[in-house]
């Protein structure tokens, strides 16, 4: 991969600070889940957002950490162990499993920086991979051979 | 949302440069799609990664931009218009549609920075939202009312 040159911000601009400020804006899914009028249930709706029309329906759970960038992440949580029948959208079909799709997302944690003599010099960013569940997917169960 | 203090890197450390270097490492899905021995097809496998066992199977397409962070993004591409039958794993079931799940991801583009008199001062980062398709999901078609 190419290596970018060092970023040279214009006068008075702290690029790291800009990154921090930009990244604190949460980015929910394009089609956000509306609050259910009924309790969350194992059924596939015929309207509404993708996560409620899916035959492997899921809800989103907010994961907020003020010491992390992004501060807000959303984790998918499956509402059914199996898939919902395409015939009715209501009962479960155990021929399919509802499985979480995971992704390792790059996040940054703030940690104290130390100067030459170990003095506290503000905060630095530490990059980590963070496992996020993106969605629930209806899959055929694995055949153990 | 809380506002973090300005990042104070230790001597000789350019935090923006660090962010750039860290972010150029692509982060594929946890369970990467192995190259198929057979041509990509509209069927749900009983083994292999999640995207090939799904009844809304998909492949990943690399989107590389050396002027963007992250440089490598992966887009899901559905292999079937409908869902695959849970009974056989090969026939399509028109009662379900295979739909892309989208997400607006924060990315950073490098652009030239300009000094006080408009002189070129290296590169700055510009934050943008970038639409990425994460997966294909089997859904019940919308009922038009």
């Amino acid at each position: 991969y190419s290596h970018w040159p060092s970023c040279c911000p214009s006068k008075g601009q702290d690029t790291s600070e800009e990154l921090l400020r930009w990244s604190t804006v949460p980015v929910p899914p394009l089609e956000p889940a509306r609050p259910n009028r009924h309790p969350e249930s194992c059924r596939a709706s015929e309207d509404g957002p993708l996560n409620s029309r899916a035959i492997s329906p899921w809800r989103y759970e907010l994961d907020r950490d003020l010491n992390r960038l992004p501060q807000d992440l959303y984790h998918a949580r499956c509402l059914c162990p199996h898939c919902v029948s395409l015939q009715t959208g209501s009962h479960m079909d155990p021929r399919g499993n509802s499985e979480l799709l995971y992704h390792n997302q790059t996040v940054f944690y703030r940690r104290p920086c130390h100067g030459e003599k170990g003095t506290h010099k503000g905060y630095c960013l530490e990059r980590r991979l963070y496992r996020v569940s993106l969605a629930c997917v209806c899959v055929r169960p694995r055949v153990m051979g | 949302y809380s506002h973090w203090p300005s990042c104070c890197p230790s001597k000789g450390q350019d935090t923006s440069e660090e962010l750039l270097r860290w972010s150029t490492v692509p982060v594929p899905p946890l369970e990467p799609a192995r190259p198929n021995r057979h041509p990509e097809s509209c069927r749900a496998s009983e083994d292999g990664p999640l995207n090939s066992r799904a009844i809304s199977p998909w492949r990943y397409e690399l989107d590389r931009d050396l002027n963007r962070l992250p440089q490598d993004l992966y887009h899901a591409r559905c292999l079937c218009p409908h869902c695959v039958s849970l009974q056989t794993g090969s026939h399509m079931d028109p009662r379900g549609n295979s739909e892309l799940l989208y997400h607006n991801q924060t990315v950073f583009y490098r652009r030239p920075c300009h000094g006080e008199k408009g002189t070129h001062k290296g590169y700055c980062l510009e934050r943008r939202l970038y639409r990425v398709s994460l997966a294909c999901v089997c859904v019940r078609p919308r009922v038009m009312g």
Partner: antibody, heavy 123, light 113 residues
Framework: QLQLQESGPGLVRPSETLSLTCSVS??????????WGWIRQPPGKGLEWIGN???????FYNPSLKGRVTISVDTSKNQFSLKLSSVTATDTAVYYC???????????????WGQGTLVTVSS | DIVMTQSPDSLVLSLGERATFNCKSS????????????LAWYQQKPGQPPKLLIY???TRESGVPDRFSGSGSGTDFSLTISSLQAEDVALYYC?????????FGQGTKVEIK
């Protein structure tokens, strides 16, 4: 053999709630091989499916009835019930209860049917 | 929703004649994974509830006389009475159970000349 019998008031006022019960005899409502349904037939017209219930309480309804329908089950009495709210004259019909087969994780045909009960919506 | 359309609306025939009526669905009710057509036929005599005659488009329910037969696949189906009897005077409905909501045709009325 299994029999179904509908019961409830024959006259309901507009805007009120229609309530009917279906009693199942010579068979258990707790069978895992069946769903239980309601179908109606306006005078001189065709059949319209209203909704279904499983003994565990899982329900699904005809979207055309716009959330006015509630079906419940009482396994101790071997009965299931229909409630249709905010009725109008267009809800006047013979209401049938029926058993619907359930096998290979799919629902199929209705058999048998109850005799039906005429419900008139009028003030 | 799947729309079921029956034709003709009524049929007036003599005893012993062959009666054929049709049912068309707005989309296929054939499941290619099991090669089954999710269609049933019912008979409704005056003042009585509907009675199941045929399921899976062509399988006769036990106790139904063999003069009744069903055929067709995909979107086009028919019910045939090979030799019309007086007790066959009734309304005949087709119904799909491929996808909820379950829907019925408007019915075909069979009468004797």
């Amino acid at each position: 053999q299994l029999q179904l019998q509908e019961s409830g008031p024959g006259l309901v006022r507009p805007s009120e709630t229609l309530s009917l019960t279906c009693s199942v005899s010579s068979g258990s409502i707790r069978s895992s091989n069946y769903y239980w349904g309601w179908i109606r037939q306006p005078p001189g017209k065709g059949l319209e499916w209203i909704g279904n219930i499983y003994y565990s309480g899982n329900t699904f309804y005809n979207p055309s009835l716009k959330g006015r329908v509630t079906i419940s089950v009482d396994t101790s009495k071997n009965q299931f019930s229909l409630k249709l709210s905010s009725v109008t004259a267009t809800d006047t019909a013979v209401y049938y209860c029926a058993r619907q087969g359930y096998s290979d994780y799919e629902l199929n045909w209705f058999d048998p049917w109850g005799q039906g009960t005429l419900v008139t919506v009028s003030s | 929703d799947i729309v079921m359309t029956q034709s003709p609306d009524s049929l007036v025939l003599s005893l012993g004649e062959r009666a054929t009526f049709n049912c068309k669905s707005s989309q296929s009710v054939l499941d290619s994974s099991n090669n089954k057509n999710y269609l049933a036929w019912y008979q409704q005599k005056p003042g009585q509830p509907p009675k199941l005659l045929i399921y899976w488009a062509s399988t006769r329910e036990s106790g139904v006389p063999d003069r009744f037969s069903g055929s067709g696949s995909g979107t086009d189906f028919s019910l045939t009475i090979s030799s019309l009897q007086a007790e066959d005077v009734a309304l005949y409905y087709c119904q799909q159970f491929y996808n909820s909501p379950w829907t019925f045709g408007q019915g075909t009325k069979v009468e004797i000349k």
